[in-house]
């Protein structure tokens, strides 16, 4: 057994199989390119501000570095796909959704048409889909990560949909609406089974899921609160009630991170108590969105993660642990429930 000798050269786990030796890592570690060494991947805060998308390391002093992107005009919503180290963002002036690698290379617009104010956007890292909410068109749409196979999922009775969060392992998407009656809604990731979770809320933003503890977090622009609830919108808790203007929000491990427009800051606190507050970065005007780039924010599994659910176009997760195949606009699903036919 080659693993018996110096652990096969592996830093952590050595697996001996008929095909040969393979190094592996415990949960929370990642194998680097030498295929032998496991490291805890570095966590970054990513934030959008005007024409900038910047990153701040949460583990080193490598603070506030701009990702070298050209042509960004007014970045708004942000997300990422950890498997290929790419970030995705919406630009509300260009009216586009774009992506690039974390080093700024291979920048491309993946959605360029039919957008008005794409203020919410999220990556389905299991199904390799892109979801977005447009406050101008009053639609929630989906496509593949490259923008192909676009489909409108929700359009009826939508009033300025804003923040969007996905739970692909469970098959649900969550969004906030800022219209006449602000609220937080949930639906299956194919747009079905829509329900209102939180009807009595102000303009909720920064909608974020704590996947481990199964809680929703959001900022309320009308009450200036940071709130939390369970995944059904119940057991609501106020995490912070003394902030002047919280806006963007994300969660990572034991902390929530938020932007405050009045304090011109990115701050963090304990996610349950709201205590132990720290300013991560100050002197920042109008930070639009904030997220933590780390593999632990994109774990889990569903049927779409395996061969796209054998769907020809879109594989859309639904509860509980299921999926449906989806077709682009004007295409129709065949009797096999897997393939789509052109009009």
């Amino acid at each position: 057994n080659p693993c018996a000798e110096e652990n096969g050269g592996c830093s952590h786990l050595c697996l001996y199989r008929p095909q040969g030796l393979r190094c592996a890592c415990p949960i929370g570690f990642e194998l680097i390119s030498d295929m032998k060494t496991c490291i805890v991947p570095e966590a970054f805060l990513l934030f959008s501000r005007r024409a900038d998308i910047r990153r701040i390391s949460l583990e080193t002093n490598n603070n506030n570095v701009a990702i070298p992107l050209t042509g960004v005009k007014e970045a708004s919503a942000l997300d990422f796909d950890v498997t290929d180290n790419r970030i995705y963002w919406t630009d509300i002036s260009l009216k586009t959704i774009s992506r690039a690698f974390m080093n700024g290379s291979a920048l491309e617009h993946v959605v360029e048409f039919g957008l008005d104010y794409p203020e919410g956007m999220a990556v389905d890292w299991l199904g390799k889909n892109l979801y977005w909410a447009d406050t101008g068109t009053n639609r929630i749409e989906v496509s593949k990560l490259d923008g192909q196979h676009r489909q409108v999922l929700v359009w009826k009775d939508l009033d300025s949909p804003r923040a969007l969060a996905l739970d692909p392992a469970e098959g649900f998407m969550y969004w906030t609406e800022w219209g006449g009656k602000p609220k937080i809604d949930r639906a299956a990731m194919d747009g079905s089974e829509r329900t209102t979770l939180v009807p009595n809320v102000g303009r909720a933003n920064g909608l974020t899921i704590d996947y481990a503890k199964r809680r929703l977090y959001w900022t309320d622009l009308d009450t200036n609160l940071i709130e939390s609830s369970n995944m059904l919108g119940l057991n609501r808790e106020v995490i912070a009630d003394d902030l002047p203007h919280p806006f963007g929000l994300t969660q990572y491990q034991d902390y929530i991170y938020w932007t405050d427009w009045s304090r011109r800051s990115i701050e963090r606190a304990n996610k349950t108590s709201g205590q132990n507050r720290t300013i991560i970065q100050g002197h920042l005007d109008y930070v639009m969105d904030i997220l933590v780039f780390h593999s632990s924010r994109q774990s889990g599994w569903n049927e779409c993660a395996s061969s796209n659910g054998h769907c020809s176009h879109l594989c859309l997760a639904v509860p509980v642990g299921g999926f449906v195949c989806g077709c682009p606009a004007h295409y129709s699903l065949n009797a096999d429930n897997r393939t789509c036919s052109a009009p």
């Epitope: 005007r50 509300i92 002036s93 104010y117 002047p244 009045s262 109008y286």
Partner: antibody
Framework: QVQLKESGPALVKPTQTLTLTCTFS??????????VGWIRQPPGKALEWLAW???????SYSTSLKTRLTISKDTSKNQVVLTMTNMDPVDTATYYC???????????WGQGTLVTVSS | DIVLTQSPATLSLSPGERATLSCRAS???????LAWYQQKPGQAPRLLIY???NRATGVPARFSGSGSGTDFTLTISSLEPEDFATYYC?????????FGQGTKVEIK
Amino acid sequence: QVQLKESGPALVKPTQTLTLTCTFSGFSLSNRGGGVGWIRQPPGKALEWLAWIDWDDDKSYSTSLKTRLTISKDTSKNQVVLTMTNMDPVDTATYYCARMHLPLVFDSWGQGTLVTVSS
Amino acid sequence: DIVLTQSPATLSLSPGERATLSCRASQFIGSRYLAWYQQKPGQAPRLLIYGASNRATGVPARFSGSGSGTDFTLTISSLEPEDFATYYCQQYYDYPQTFGQGTKVEIK
């Protein structure tokens, strides 16, 4: 209720230094965010932004007047002070202080104080 | 510095009429970094609109803002007697923030 009031000399001589004080109530510049800015308006003319200071003591100045302006705050007294050196008759204007709850948006204003520069 | 050009310089209208004021930036200032202020003679300016389209607290619904990029508009849907004043736009996309030269809305 947010209130701001400017105070300072109504008349200054050319080359002198102008010191204006903004005393405010209804908000704080401690840790609750926001800031205070100064804007002036020559008689019959448009508004011109001069400077601002935020809760965290970050400061910003008008490009053209940067070398002549200094802004500071006294959090305990709820005051912001603007000094402007080397005054000239063209600096004759009504000087306003205003609160910024959101950066660079002036949502509450003082009544203004007219400063005349003349020998 | 970014220059804001307001037009027209003077707008002569009657109460009840619709007023449309324009503010054009010399370069791109995004979709939400513009404010509008109202100033009456002998008074301090008053914030009307921020973020290009958000009404400030206590501002009547007849005031609305729109636009993005370089072209912005303040609309007063039906002029009331107290609306006759001078209106200034202000950009805060880039430092230093700057004001337009104003549009005076006068009674015809």
